[in-house]
Interface confidence: low
Amino acid sequence: EAHKSEIAHRFKDLGEQHFKGLVLIAFSQYLQKCPYEEHIKLVQEVTDFAKTCVADENAENCDKSIHTLFGDKLCAIPKLRDNYGELADCCAKQEPERNECFLQHKDDNPNLPPFQRPEAEAMCTSFQENPTSFLGHYLHEVARRHPYFYAPELLYYAEKYNEVLTQCCTESDKAACLTPKLDAVKEKALVAAVRQRMKCSSMQRFGERAFKAWAVARMSQRFPNAEFAEITKLATDVTKINKECCHGDLLECADDRAELAKYMCENQATISSKLQACCDKPVLQKSQCLAEIEHDNIPADLPSIAADFVEDKEVCKNYAEAKDVFLGTFLYEYSRRHPDYSVSLLLRLAKKYEATLEKCCAEGDPPACYGTVLAEFQPLVEEPKNLVKTNCELYEKLGEYGFQNAVLVRYTQKAPQVSTPTLVEAARNLGRVGTKCCTLPEAQRLPCVEDYLSAILNRLCVLHEKTPVSEKVTKCCSGSLVERRPCFSALTVDETYVPKEFKAETFTFHSDICTLPDKEKQIKKQTALAELVKHKPKATEDQLKTVMGDFAQFVDKCCKAADKDNCFATEGPNLVARSKEALA
């Protein structure tokens, strides 16, 4: 239904607190360099304006679209061109082009320092003094670093953050209480960020149809007792919601997400038997709970998939009559039977099925032609299963850090032209798949591994797109989203790469490494490892092991020395010489 004032409508639906949070996220995602104080001033102005529209929908400018109102606010910022360069050119455009222009200037890798968590006491003091401002800073800092973060989900994480601080800041040992809890929230939020970026990439590159297919597969796995029409309705709504958030329509997105949660809770009987516990929660938690819901039990009496999609003599007729619906039902039927497959795999199978029907239905004897299609799925299913098996075995043998290093070597060999920081980030994230997925029961491993890897590789593609340096990476990133992971897995050592010359300064370290937190120490070592591989792309595993072992001993020895600086200065050149020799 149409509303006289869109902004008043959203303010009433969302309530002041969520409204303000979402406006702050929107501004922080568009203008990633602005300080919190500047954004919060704009948020207050927009909120005050929304309140006047609630009081009188006919008031001046209340009929303007939210994009127009937000864009006008952003374009009125003084010194916009000084701080943002060509983004200021967007302000010369009219809506909807202006918003599109803002979206194109979102930076996936903004030049911002890593978000440093303050020391526990300081954190609790500032939280207790002004919880609203503290959580506002959290929203701002996360949103500007992750310009595609799913806004309603970020509000949920801010709520979690609030809960943790409320609980831990009353404890005597605040740090012991805060650290593990905030680490857990951070880990979940970072995974959520790469997953959502993948959804927006899917929407931007391949459109709504591709995203909807993803949603149909996912919903069918979760809700195998729901009818196809129900799954279609849910997938349509989820597609709309994600399109809105990816497009910067955060108020509408959050409002529609709450509506969908309400619909699901009112229609549990036709969706899933597992929803009740979620439906008793408040709105943000309810939506989050529904998004993470466990799979319902598969109906016991499901007939073989072959009956309708292979053995039926009218397969080609049914396909010709309504291609999208027929393929949609195939994806639904296959997915509801296979919660143990990744969505990427299910979409590859649906694509294979479609290609088979396209070919066979044009031939003289279609049933004979498509009769073997299910058997032809086998290699497509085996490939990711083998990937999971070999990688989980390697993870169990090496542990997370060792596994990350193995992945780093592999990916540096595949794409040595990619910048070392990007390779290290990607390998560290890819390496976490072990901890995240390999400990799960067998039936959950494949979907966990492949869908997580796909999201991480999407981040690699997004960063590479900004400064393309590797033809192989460009090739894998340009293809279909569901083929990306197999494409990267199939890459081998890049034979065209001219090895980097050995630079002693790349392998020169100082005593400052000793005081770094463990994570930063690991990154330093992994940076050196990537540089070694770039210098010697065909180095053997043993050679790299020797050099890295030597390096670890050197750092350990010098960090324990009385005169650390002297140790690094004298032992460093020896290490460099030994490394060159070992790799000769």
Epitope: E227, A229, K233, D237, N267, D308, E314, G328, E333
Partner: nanobody, 119 residues
Framework: EVQLLESGGGLVQPGGSLRLSCAAS????????MLWVRQAPGKGLEWVSV????????YYADSVKGRFTISRDNSKNTLYLQMNSLRAEDTAVYYC????????????WGQGTLVTVSS
């Protein structure tokens, strides 16, 4: 026995509008998703639009998006298709069908209503 009866077809000029209706009986209409499909002269069946049992439209074929609107009145057991900005290529027999629960076969059809768009 399931019965679907379409009406509202006829001759209309390009750019004109028509509203098709489909009266349903013999099954629980308010728990069934419904759809419109059409068959142009000498062509195969083309699916037009699906509406979910709750009344939220789910799908429109690209060829009709923005011009056609599917709706339903569960209290009257009736399905509608509002067709605006009609074009010559919309000329076809329009059928309403009960959406199947699992696969792509449409079990129950009406007898169809002819829409002709011509100047």
């Amino acid at each position: 026995e399931v019965q679907l009866l379409e009406s509202g077809g006829g001759l209309v000029q390009p750019g004109g509008s028509l509203r098709l209706s489909c009266a349903a009986s013999g099954f629980t209409f308010d728990t069934s998703s419904m759809l419109w499909v059409r068959q142009a002269p000498g062509k195969g069946l083309e699916w037009v639009s699906v509406i979910h049992q709750s009344g939220t439209p789910t799908y429109y074929a690209d060829s009709v998006k923005g011009r056609f609107t599917i709706s339903r009145d569960n209290s009257k057991n009736t399905l509608y298709l509002q067709m605006n900005s009609l074009r010559a290529e919309d000329t076809a027999v329009y059928y309403c069908a009960k959406f199947p629960s699992t696969h792509g076969k449409f079990d129950y059809w009406g007898q169809g209503t002819l829409v002709t768009v011509s100047s």
